[in-house]
């Protein structure tokens, strides 16, 4: 039995890969910030979970996916107030028990050190300092992610 | 509602570097992006850089080597320098809040003379 | 660059009728977002512009309904449907499919 939440993750995810293929992105459109190979878009207004993962997608874009620690650092170093919070695609699955990424990959124990409890209706968020499990009905912040197609000799844009 | 106000000298040497800062009242500078536009006497708009909260900017092409737009959340305020400016840079300077390409709330504009 | 032309750089319009302002761009203003991130801007008279119309379509708040904009790819246009005397100024069109580039911009003028 699926939640409303994942059946959500699951429908916006599979439409994405039915649109058609773009051609790469080579840099970052305009508004997008770049960090590293991906282009990130922090946004401005708050949603619950499930309304900031279908914006990201309305963006052709999904919601932050979060390879390593190393990454999550340098995606908190971006953010300037420590008050506030982003939702990322991390979400708890209800029928496998396990926090699921919206890639359908499993988080990996040693990636995250999740403040709160992992249920149902959990989502997750980051601070500048940490990563929080939230009610996915929480209106917060989110931050959407495009990847960039590697380049030899690339021109990064300003940072 | 949102209010911006530019503030700095209205008279700037050859050569020197041009700084002005825009207050923002009525909301924070935590959210958006903050842009910088200007506009010579009599003629149309160019847009200089923005910068967003979380404090990464983008330029002009034009000015790039020459602007710096930085942001002090706790005074709700942003600002710019331009350096190195000649004649063509007298203008009127106006800040703005930019919604993602729609700049919805302007400062009243202030004119920068470059003259020595 | 994106250059935005506008049509025409001047128009005179008798008060109560309509006015219709073009412009084109030099290419497709379709963001990657899937965006079209061209709005247009009121300059009156020694006033800073002000925000009328934002992605092709949506008029800003507290613009009267008379202002419209429509359009797509690489054609838009702002539509006055009555011209009132408060309307008199210079109207910008704006795009921000790459770093924002304006129209040069057309002086409407009361006949």
């Known amino acids: 039995q699926k939640s409303s939440i994942e059946k959500c993750s699951v429908d916006i995810q599979q439409s994405r890969n039915k649109t058609t293929e773009r051609p790469g992105l080579l840099n970052c459109p305009i508004y997008w910030q770049q960090l590293r190979e991906k282009c990130l878009l922090f946004s401005h207004t708050v949603n619950p979970w499930n309304n900031s993962l279908a914006d990201c997608s309305t963006k052709e874009s999904s919601l932050l996916l979060i390879r390593d620690k190393d990454e999550l650092i340098h995606t908190q170093n971006l953010i300037r107030d420590k008050a506030i919070l982003f939702w990322i695609g991390l979400n708890f699955s209800l029928s496998e028990k396990n926090w699921k990424w919206i890639n359908g990959s499993f988080l990996n124990s040693n990636d995250l050190e999740i403040r709160g409890d992992a249920k149902e209706n959990s989502c997750i968020s980051i601070s500048q300092t940490s990563v929080y499990s939230e009610y996915c009905s929480t209106e917060i912040r989110w931050i959407c992610q495009k990847e960039l197609t590697p380049v030899r000799n690339k021109v990064y844009p300003d940072s | 509602q949102v209010q911006l106000q530019e503030s700095g000298p209205g008279l700037v040497k050859p050569s020197e570097t041009l700084s002005l800062t825009c207050t923002v009242s009525?909301?924070?500078?935590?959210?958006?992006?903050w842009s910088w536009i200007r506009q010579p006497p009599g003629r149309g708009l160019e847009w200089i850089g923005y910068?967003?909260?979380?404090?990464?900017?983008n330029y002009n092409p034009s000015l790039k080597s020459r602007v710096t737009i930085s942001l002090d959340t706790s005074k709700n305020q942003f600002s710019l320098k331009l350096n190195s400016v000649t004649a063509a840079d007298t203008a009127v300077y106006y800040c703005?809040?930019?919604?993602?390409?729609?700049?919805?709330?302007w400062g009243q504009g202030t004119l920068v003379t470059v003259s020595s | 660059d994106i250059v935005m032309t506008q049509t025409p750089l001047s128009s005179p319009v008798t008060l109560g009728q309509p006015a219709s302002i073009s412009c084109r761009s030099s290419?497709?203003?379709?963001?990657?977002?899937?965006?079209?991130?061209l709005s247009w801007l009121q300059q009156r008279p020694g006033q800073p512009p002000r925000l009328l119309i934002y992605k092709i379509s949506n008029r800003f708040s507290g613009v009267p309904d008379r202002f419209s904009g429509s359009g797509a790819g690489t054609d838009f246009t702002l539509k006055i449907s009555r011209v009132e005397a408060e309307d008199v100024g210079v109207y910008y069109c704006?795009?921000?499919?790459?770093?924002?580039?304006f129209g040069q911009g057309t002086r409407l003028e009361i006949k």
């Open positions: 290419e497709s203003l379709v963001h990657s977002d899937g965006n079209t991130y």
């Open positions: 009525g909301g924070s500078i935590s959210s958006y992006y």
């Open positions: 910068i967003y909260y979380i404090g990464s900017t």
């Open positions: 704006m795009q921000a499919a790459q770093f924002p580039t």
């Open positions: 703005a809040r930019d919604m993602m390409g729609a700049l919805d709330y």
